[in-house]
Interface confidence: medium
């Protein structure tokens, strides 16, 4: 079980980051779905490895004082929605903005229907071309 | 099937990076090789976790206007190369030089004979001491 | 067999991060064990994919002319310390300081007692709010 | 349905230049990383350069480096190369191309015949 999808422009003033099986993407099989276009869903008990990695630009004085920070988060049935991980960036001084990268990663067990997705403090920011920003994860 | 290898300085102007079989590296057998050390290729089909991370050190006025991007790029045996995934992040301001990380990773399918190859900006930039830049894969 | 815990901030000292199973971690048996709260230590011999992330905020003014560096690294029995990973990023110029995350990751080779654990140049710089530090494995 | 159409090649003196395009329809051309390859009388398709949907990565292969440029308006939806330094190794039918995940679209081509 495995998938990987990238990332895709949405007009949602949404945080949660949006994603699509374009381009060079995996969906291994049926057991793992990308639901609304944001979250991953897994049918099957088990550990998972799960990353992301988000590519955004952004300068310190257009932005707000508060970093940019990246969430990857776990929504299990009958249950409230948690922060597995966070990555934190500061806004650069570049202009018109400076590109940054994140990448989050780590292993976490899962429930039958869990969905985990990327919640993002500023969506505008984020990079969409080819290759920079993507989600996925990996049944062990 | 598992490969980790490790960055090599290079006295070459291409932009791809070069890798060795040298210090804590990995090899697990040969359905995986390095190729003319530029390249990790594999055997068999499937899907596979590959990953990338390069430290660099930059100075926002030494160099271009452009960030430095790593690109995570694949070959394919009768297809076009084509870009997996990719990272930037803006030049420091730091003197005489800013050292950066940049990381990437994610599960894509490979066909037999398939290569993933390193690409950044200004291989000039990467820090070659233990540790700080390395590559890899492995097979799910 | 896998392992994901979480950061814990620490009166110590040492280099070395503090890690604890608190929170949304990962022990997946004991044939992976969290030491002393400072290392995972592995009773198989395999290949093993390790990844950590610091988060942490620092100021260029406050800090040290060196960038902040984060280190995997890797005890054998019988053997000397080794660095399998490290990742450098220049300190802030935001003030108070300003939060940047690292991200490390990659295949070892592991013997039956190896400890795997993170070190950094400053562990009071370390930013240990909800998923922004962790550490963790798993056995391919 | 996507759609690509070359245009821009023709006959040319060893050390010339030529421009082509590439007029792209059908998907959201901004969205996409690009490329050309092309095809000599009687040998297999070969990777020319390809660029990244926002234009600002690009690669070559190393016969072509320093002498072609690719480039992209995204505005036009229109993929360029600039060839400049033309050899007669440089002979055979450009394609643009999209890479996608299980098979490439590639449009009709356009012959570049370099001869003095």
């Known amino acids: 079980i495995a998938a990987h999808v990238i990332s895709e422009a949405s007009s949602k003033t949404t945080s949660v980051l949006q994603w699509a099986e374009k381009g060079y993407y995996t969906m291994s099989n049926n057991l793992v779905t990308l639901e609304n276009g944001k979250q991953l869903t897994v049918k099957r008990q088990g550990l998972y490895y799960i990353y992301a990695q988000v590519t955004f630009c952004s300068n310190r004085e257009a932005s707000s004082q508060a970093p940019f920070i990246a969430s990857l988060c776990l929504k299990s049935p009958g249950r409230f929605e948690r922060i597995l991980l966070r990555a934190a960036n500061t806004h650069s001084s570049a202009k018109p903005c400076g590109q940054q990268s994140i990448h989050l990663g780590g292993v976490f067990e899962l429930q039958p229907g869990a969905s985990v997705f990327v919640n993002v403090t500023d969506p505008s920011q984020v990079s969409h071309g080819t290759g920079f920003t993507s989600f996925g994860l990996l049944k062990l | 099937i598992a490969a980790h290898v490790i960055s090599e300085a290079s006295s070459k102007t291409t932009s791809v990076l070069q890798w060795a079989e040298k210090g804590y590296y990995t090899m697990s057998n040969n359905l995986v090789t390095l190729e003319n050390g530029k390249q990790l290729t594999v055997k068999r089909q499937g899907l596979y976790y590959i990953y990338a991370q390069v430290t660099f050190c930059s100075n926002r006025e030494a160099s271009s206007q452009a960030p430095f991007i790593a690109s995570l790029c694949l070959k394919s045996p009768g297809r076009f190369e084509r870009i997996l995934l990719r990272a930037a992040n803006t030049h420091s301001s730091a003197k005489p030089c800013g050292q950066q990380s940049i990381h990437l990773g994610g599960v894509f399918e490979l066909q037999p004979g398939a290569s993933v190859f390193v690409n950044v900006t200004d291989p000039s930039q990467v820090s070659h001491g233990t540790g700080f830049t390395s590559f890899g894969l492995l097979k799910l | 067999i896998a392992a994901h815990v979480i950061s814990e901030a620490s009166s110590k000292t040492t280099s070395v991060l503090q890690w604890a199973e608190k929170g949304y971690y990962t022990m997946s048996n004991n044939l992976v064990t969290l030491e002393n709260g400072k290392q995972l230590t592995v009773k198989r011999q395999g290949l093993y994919y390790i990844y950590a992330q610091v988060t942490f905020c620092s100021n260029r003014e406050a800090s040290s002319q060196a960038p902040f560096i984060a280190s995997l690294c890797l005890k054998s029995p019988g053997r000397f310390e080794r660095i399998l990973l490290r990742a450098a990023n220049t300190h802030s110029s935001a003030k108070p300081c300003g939060q940047q995350s690292i991200h490390l990751g990659g295949v070892f080779e592991l013997q039956p007692g190896a400890s795997v654990f993170v070190n950094v140049t400053d562990p009071s710089q370390v930013s240990h709010g909800t998923g922004f530090t962790s550490f963790g494995l798993l056995k391919l | 349905e996507v759609q690509l159409l070359e245009s821009g090649g023709g006959l040319v003196q060893p050390g010339g230049s030529l421009r082509l395009s590439c007029a792209a329809s059908g998907f959201t051309f901004a969205l996409y990383q690009m490329a050309w390859v092309r095809q000599a009388p009687g040998k297999g398709l070969e990777w020319v350069s390809s660029?990244?949907?926002?234009?600002?990565?690009?690669y070559y292969a190393d016969s072509v480096k320093g002498r072609f440029t690719i480039s992209r308006d995204n505005s036009k939806n229109t993929l360029y190369l600039q060839m400049n330094s033309l050899r007669a190794e440089d002979t055979a039918v450009y394609y643009c191309?999209?890479?996608?995940?299980?098979?490439?679209?590639w449009g009709q081509g356009t012959l570049v015949t370099v001869s003095s």
């Open positions: 660029i990244d949907s926002s234009g600002s990565d690009t």
């Open positions: 191309a999209k890479p996608e995940r299980d098979f490439d679209y």
